[in-house]
């Protein structure tokens, strides 16, 4: 059977256009050629396969649909628009597939999708409108309720001459169309910072991980109207110190548990208000494994045992005394 | 200190419906996502649903599927199951337990760290 | 869903032997694996979580290893308060799942 999928041009309309009606519906029992399918599971696998395009042909019935491990390096508007629509596809994994690109409006005409998962692809240009649609002012919402964006850091040398962190976080802004994710992975991604106004269209977050990204500090970010939030992970990270304004925003979530392994915390006196948090909050489990790794005299200790008279600066000499 | 008190259990005919209540003392209640857990007479333990602090999500075993609803109402530190369509074989006890996650998508596992005491729910004619 | 396969599913032992439980995964679980001990007419108690920590307030005779597909419980030397029925249990995939016990009775 072919593997041609088509791929309507950037003016899509809201209704998959009339050329899709050009390829034969699939038959019922149908299965893409290098694929499994089960109607029984409703399950497509594709697994594998070095497929360069989304098959044409996948079964109306498929409810998740497994695309990893292939060569697809761009994702086009309506990659998934068929006649009949694929009413009932819900989870959508493509990691691991080579993608560079993933267009605006890629998952139109997917009106039950509720996870995807890109993890693993080299993203260096993901459309603003990637979620949102291609026409964002006329598209609703998106059904997605879990999004996974583990690793998906392009190779330096393949970086757009933009903030990757800002790429990402406007396809998360637009449109407001993800107002209703619960689950975001952002895993891995080297970020350096969270844009300021990253989370502000995501009220219905529940677990958001960035585990494993570059994170120096929490400074910029606003977690206030997460009220919704269950666990939110910033382990291995390069966290120095978390300072009170994010404390107190953490701490006025009713829901929320945060996850602070592996960073590298400097002990110095700027710690002691995290320090006190930490004694009387039950928001950080593990927190007892909590441990400095600057000064170097206070390697190893663990925060919850220092108290004030541990954590001291060194005094900052009078700028006529500083040298370069 | 922290602890669950049950309630609710009971004899109930097939087909009928019960309603159990674990209040939750000690501990912020909204910070934890609870589970029922059930032991038929001289069976081993079967996880029978979860619900994560908020309140938000939850899950069921597929033997309880469309029957049992997980709830839990944060002012009042209650955690409820609404059991439905009732057969033979939901026989149990039944106990809840505070769970060490928040989020029912977690990847840190701390145990189920307290139990309540169990209540005894028969399903017989 | 993941089947948890302990055994032995008795182990006859003395106060002061050393008893080692073993659960095995049908697939991995990486280290999202917990044990409970249970008493006649008890709820159970949580000793481990994560393969390998103990929980608050448990004595340091209980330890847990493993990884992956195969975990062990080890109690160095039974206490006359030992003797129960202990289970494994995974939250690595949905539903979370038990073992069906291993009884440590007294020889």
């Known amino acids: 059977s072919s593997l041609t999928s088509w791929a309507p041009s950037a003016a899509a309309s809201t209704s998959p256009p009339a050329s899709a009606a050009s390829a034969p519906p699939p038959l019922p029992g149908q299965c893409p050629q290098p694929c499994e399918c089960s109607e029984a599971a409703r399950t497509v696998k594709c697994v594998n396969r070095n497929l360069t395009e989304v098959p044409a042909d996948l079964p109306p019935y498929v409810r998740n649909l497994f695309l990893t491990g292939n060569q697809l390096a761009v994702l086009p508007p309506g990659a998934f628009a068929r006649r009949p629509p694929l009413a009932e596809l819900a989870a959508l994994n493509l990691s691991g597939s080579s993608l560079r690109e993933v267009c605006a409006g890629a998952f139109e005409h997917l009106p039950s999708l509720r996870q995807l998962d890109l993890s693993h692809n080299p993203l260096g240009n993901l459309s603003a409108f990637a979620f949102a649609g291609s026409d964002a002012s006329r598209s609703g919402p998106s059904p997605l309720v879990e999004l996974m964006l583990n690793h998906i850091v392009p190779p330096d040398d393949r970086r757009q001459n933009r903030s990757f962190e800002g790429m990402v976080a406007a396809a998360l802004r637009a449109g407001r169309a993800l107002r209703g994710l619960q689950c975001l992975e952002l895993a891995g991604n080297r970020f350096l910072y969270l844009p300021r106004d990253v989370l502000a269209q995501l009220p219905g977050l529940r677990h958001l991980d960035l585990r494993n990204n570059s994170l120096v500090s929490l400074t910029y970010v606003s977690f206030r109207n997460l009220t919704h939030l269950e666990s939110l992970h910033l382990e291995d990270n390069a966290l120095k110190v978390l300072h009170n304004a994010t404390l107190a925003e953490l701490q006025s979530l009713p829901h929320v548990r945060v996850f602070l392994d592996n960073n590298p915390w400097v002990c110095d006196c700027h710690m002691a208000d995290m320090v006190a948090w930490l004694k009387e909050t039950e928001v950080v489990p593990g927190k007892a494994g909590l441990t400095c790794a600057f000064p170097e005299k206070m390697r190893n200790r663990a925060l919850l045992e220092l108290n004030s008279s541990h954590l001291d600066c060194d005094p900052i000499l009078p700028p006529s005394l500083q040298t370069s | 200190q922290v602890q669950l008190v049950q309630s609710g259990g009971g004899l109930v005919q097939p087909g009928g419906s019960l309603r159990l209540s674990c209040a939750a003392s000690g501990f912020t209640f909204s910070r934890n996502a609870m589970s029922w857990v059930r032991q038929a007479p001289g069976k081993g333990l079967e996880w029978v649903s979860a619900?994560?602090?908020?309140?938000?999500?939850?899950h069921d075993a597929d033997s309880v599927k469309g029957r049992f609803t997980i709830s839990r109402d944060n002012s009042k530190n209650t955690l409820y199951l609404e059991m439905n369509s009732l057969r033979a074989e939901d026989t149990a006890v039944y106990y809840c337990a505070k769970d060490g996650y928040s989020s029912l998508w977690d990847y840190h596992y701390y145990g189920m760290d307290v139990w309540g005491q169990g209540t005894t729910v028969t399903v017989s004619s | 869903e993941i089947v948890l396969t302990q055994s032995p599913a008795t182990l006859s032992l003395s106060p002061g032997e050393r008893a080692t439980l073993s659960c095995r995964a049908s697939q991995s679980v990486s280290s999202y694996l917990a044990w409970y001990q249970q008493k006649p007419g008890q709820a159970p108690r949580l000793l481990i979580y994560d393969a390998s920590n103990r929980a608050t307030g448990i004595p340091a005779r209980f330890s847990g290893s493993g990884s992956g597909t195969d975990f062990t419980l080890t109690i160095s030397s039974l206490e006359p308060e030992d003797f129960a029925v202990y289970y494994c249990?995974?939250?690595?995939?949905?539903?979370?799942?038990f073992g069906q016990g291993t009884k440590v009775e007294i020889k």
């Open positions: 249990q995974q939250r690595s995939n949905w539903p979370p799942t």
């Open positions: 619900i994560s602090g908020s309140g938000g999500s939850t």
